[in-house]
């Protein structure tokens, strides 16, 4: 059962001092989603018992395993049902506390009733303030039964529930017809899923015989021990003022557990702490009584004395619950109450015994839950005890349950039951997850959902190249951290699998499903350098670069040119997708801008080192295009061009540039400067006869301007081949300006 206790402080004279505390002894309890388990929850449950709304209650977390509810302002705040929820996953457990008003018309003789399936439950409500009206019994808030007020027996109204079944469990209340719900007597009925002394799915298994008022859990057969007792069968008393499954918790305050109600997981319910009784748990046990609610009687023999917290304290030479066993009778010593092994392991179990006559190897035996008896393979005999060692056959799940070590001598016999939990090693249900990859390493998240049992003690990551027959490489990692697989081959697929382990021998689970993770390309290592660049216009830049010569193939897919405009804080990236390229034309740049330029080699998504940067200043944008460009053939080698000056000039023109190209020709165009900017006409000489030419021109101020329209004209006749065009210009005369 989950180690979860809900404590109610019942000092009811002052509701503001009332508090509820939920304490978990579970590992990692209450730490929230960053640990293995969800947090503890403690709340008032208003679904069944609705009380007038008050100020909100204050919840305070004290460390990782304790939560306290305070802020009750008036007695009516206390009345009703409170619950604490703790434990993780399938072990998530709700502990319930039902609070009755001490001033109610009806009071429960006993709040919690735990009964077996098929039993008759009797709820008894004692008349505290009489009303001459019907008494209504409700179950989980709905009408259940009516009693006439005359039907009280000895000042009590009884509700008999014959042959109860688990669905009958819940909150019951008895209320006078015209009374407020705060005047009700509230009860909690817990119906175990099995008949007395049985547990398991078909109630086929036998309970271990819980002592000191412990209750056998109908699902797992474990004893839920009263506060103040521990052990598989609750056979051991805690020191006064301590509680929890291992007696690890201590009652707060100087008066120990006085005034505290303890609620434990079903089917136990609630009771006073060991040594206390009464509706407010403030009365010490009467002589001869002990335990929770003082329900147990000592009946000590052979001079034993009764301690109200632990029961009989035996004089030397005697032991047993009632000091009824002589120390001559053999006795099992220091047997662990619970052992845990992994499935399919073959553990060794030791069982030590003492007595007179002295136990020998053959007098100690081990009995499994299915009744199989194991004999010890060897025994270690010491002056004060004999320890028998048992080699257990390969464990199966059915071996989970209560085992028994038994010693028999002529002096008598003793046996000790202990719980064996056979755990299933964890097996990942999913493959690990790739977080990031590089050329030589993969970062992997190894923690995945798993079948089987936790906790996870180690995580092993197995990996090897895909389709390889070589041995797997293995790395052991912390369960909560990501793993970096290093020294891998670039651009290689790796098969990666997770293996989980739980504590103990044989705790390694099977490997989980594989997943394919691929490393990145190798990083390009060569650093280019910029050979040069020249401006081909106010918005065009031609760049060239080189790479160092190295043996072997070039590791790279292309080049990335970066232009950084520091003034505007903008970066321009140009991708050159051939690794053989060594030049590129950058267009669409911003005229008059100062750029920082660099180039780097890339491979897949990885960039190599950048070249040393160059600083380039593009000229500002030039003037508008000249207007009305016209061409007129003058001879077989001359063509005259005329134009008009551009409009809206930003400054004086420094020159014109004429572009001459043979129509349909494949060669580069020729640029000819007209250095006298005032002219509006020029003659291009040295042309070939009977050849069609294309002309366009632009002006320059600080930078070159826009091109004019293109015009076509053919030279005349069939003259000799000219050496190449030249130019003569003058201011166009009015007569020539057509």
């Amino acid at each position: 059962a989950v180690d979860l206790t809900l404590l109610a402080n019942l000092r009811l004279t002052d509701p503001q001092r009332f508090f509820l505390t939920c304490v978990s002894g579970e590992a990692g309890a209450g730490r929230g989603s960053d640990a293995w388990g969800p947090p503890l929850l403690l709340e008032k449950d208003d679904r069944i018992v609705r009380t007038p709304p008050g100020p909100p209650l204050r919840l305070a977390r004290n460390g990782s395993h304790q939560v306290t509810l305070r802020g009750f302002s008036k007695p009516s705040d206390l009345v009703g049902v409170f619950s604490c929820v703790g434990g993780a996953g399938a072990r998530r457990t709700r502990v319930i506390y039902v609070h009755n008003s001490p001033g109610a018309h009806l009071l429960p003789d006993k709040v919690t009733h735990t009964v077996n399936k098929g039993d008759t439950a009797v709820l008894s409500a004692r008349v505290h303030k009489e009303k001459q009206t019907d008494v209504i019994w409700k179950s989980n808030g709905s009408y259940f039964y009516t009693l006439d007020w005359h039907e009280a027996q000895d000042g009590r109204f009884l509700l008999q529930l014959p042959n109860v079944q688990p669905p009958s469990s819940g909150i019951y209340s008895a209320t006078y017809l015209e009374a407020s719900p705060l005047g009700s007597a509230f009860f909690r009925l817990i119906v175990r899923g099995c008949g007395a002394g049985r547990w398991g799915p078909g109630c086929t298994k036998e309970c271990p015989g819980c002592l000191h008022g412990g209750v056998c859990h109908d699902h797992d057969g474990e004893c839920v021990c009263p506060p103040g007792f521990t052990g598989t069968r609750c056979e051991q008393a805690c020191r006064e003022g301590r509680f929890g499954q291992s007696c690890q918790e201590q009652c707060p305050g100087i008066s120990g557990c006085r005034g505290l109600t303890f609620c434990l997981p079903d089917p136990y319910g609630c009771s006073c702490g060991s040594g206390w009784r009464g509706s407010q748990c403030q009365e010490a046990c009467a002589p001869g009584h002990f335990g929770a609610d003082c329900r147990l009687q000592c009946q000590c023999q052979n001079g034993g004395t009764c301690d109200r917290f632990s029961g009989c304290v035996c004089p030397s030479g005697w032991h047993g619950v009632h000091c009824e066993k002589s120390d001559r009778i053999p006795q099992i010593l220091n047997m662990a109450s619970e052992l845990e092994f992994n499935l399919e392991t073959m553990p060794r179990i030791n069982c030590a015994a003492a007595g007179n006559p002295f136990p020998v190897r053959g007098s100690i035996e081990l009995r499994k839950p299915d009744g199989t008896v194991l004999l010890s393979t060897k025994a270690i005999v010491e002056p004060e005890k004999t320890t028998a060692e048992f080699e257990v056959p390969r464990l199966v799940l059915a071996d989970s349950g209560f085992w028994e070590c038994r010693v028999s001598t002529s002096g008598g016999q003793d046996s000790r039951r202990f719980k064996v939990n056979v755990k299933v090693p964890p097996v990942p249900l999913a493959a690990p997850r790739l977080l990031t990859k590089q050329s030589r390493q993969l970062v992997v998240s190894p923690l995945v959902s798993f079948s089987g049992d936790g906790p996870i003690s180690t995580v092993r990551l197995h990996y090897r190249p895909q389709d390889s027959t070589m041995d797997w490489s293995t790395i052991v990692v912390d369960p909560s951290e990501n793993v970096t697989l290093m020294n891998l081959r670039p651009k290689t697929g790796y098969s990666v699998r997770v293996q989980l382990s739980r504590p103990g021998e044989g705790g390694e689970g099977a490997w989980g499903p594989p997943t394919l993770m691929t490393t990145d390309c190798p990083e390009p290592l060569l650093q280019p350098w910029l050979e040069g660049w020249h401006v081909e216009g106010t918005d065009r830049l031609r760049v060239s670069w080189s790479l160092p010569l190295v043996p072997g193939p070039l590791v790279g897919d292309g080049f990335l040119l970066r232009l950084w405009d520091g003034t505007r804080g903008q970066e321009r990236r140009e991708n050159v997708s051939s690794p053989q390229a060594r030049t590129a034309l950058l267009t669409g740049l911003t005229p008059g801008t100062h750029y920082q330029l660099d180039v780097q080699l890339y491979h897949c998504t990885l960039l190599g080192p950048a070249s040393p940067p160059a600083h380039v200043l593009l000229p500002p944008s030039g003037p508008p295009a000249p207007r009305h460009l016209h061409a007129q053939a003058l001879s077989d080698s001359e063509i005259q061009l005329t134009w008009k000056h551009p409009e809206a000039l930003p400054g004086p023109i420094s020159k014109y540039v004429v572009e001459v190209q043979v129509a349909g020709g494949a060669g580069d165009p020729l640029w000819i400067d007209v250095d006298r900017p005032e002219e509006t006409s020029t003659i291009i000489r040295g042309l070939n006869a009977s050849t069609r030419y294309l002309f366009r021109m632009r002006a320059s101020i600080q930078g070159l301007g826009d091109w004019s329209n293109t015009v076509e004209e053919s030279t005349l006749g069939n003259g000799l081949q000219a050496e190449g065009p030249v130019q003569e210009s003058r201011a166009a005369e009015e007569g020539l300006d057509q």
Partner: antibody, heavy 124, light 108 residues
Amino acid sequence: EVQLLESGGGLVQPGGSLRLSCAASGFTFSRYRMDWVRQAPGKGLEWVSGIYPSGGHTYYADSVKGRFTISRDNSKNTLYLQMNSLRAEDTATYYCARLYLWGSYPTQVAFDIWGQGTMVTVSS
Amino acid sequence: DIQMTQSPGTLSLSPGERATLSCRASQSVSSTYLAWYQQKPGQAPRLLIYGASSRATGIPDRFTGSGSGTDFTLTISRLEPEDFAVYYCQHYGSSPLTFGGGTKVEIK
């Protein structure tokens, strides 16, 4: 389906006896208070008697006290009304009814299920 | 004993009209134990309202109960043909249980 079915009515002479039965079905009879209500021809409703679930406590209208006895058999889901020393003024249709209590606070009470009635005629 | 008096004895109205029925207790009673029933000729009574104002399952919302102390009212906002019947109020307290004398709602 929740229902109540009365039987046992008929013609009887003054001073005679009759036993009415009411068979319940569709609900847990043993948990509810049950009552008899009658209606003389052309008149209003008159409460006659009531019995608590345990059968241990019973109540009667003054007009029938000492002559009528209400009882129940929870194992048979049946309510009875034993009528002795019958008079002409007992002539009526007799209905059995379930007293229901709504679980909220404050608890509300009413007869939510009625039988179809059985006619009792007392005449010489 | 508590007496329950209903008025008027007969109420003659046309379909679509509003009906207001009154029930007066001889002493103050708890509204949570006041119920109204409808009875048609040859049929058993049928629960309409419990707790003075809560409609029973399946009862149309044209039926409304109200009141406290000694004076209680059943209102039928718009009479439908099937609403013409006798209506009884009833109180549950210490024995005996008491019914009012009834109000007959008939077609005008």
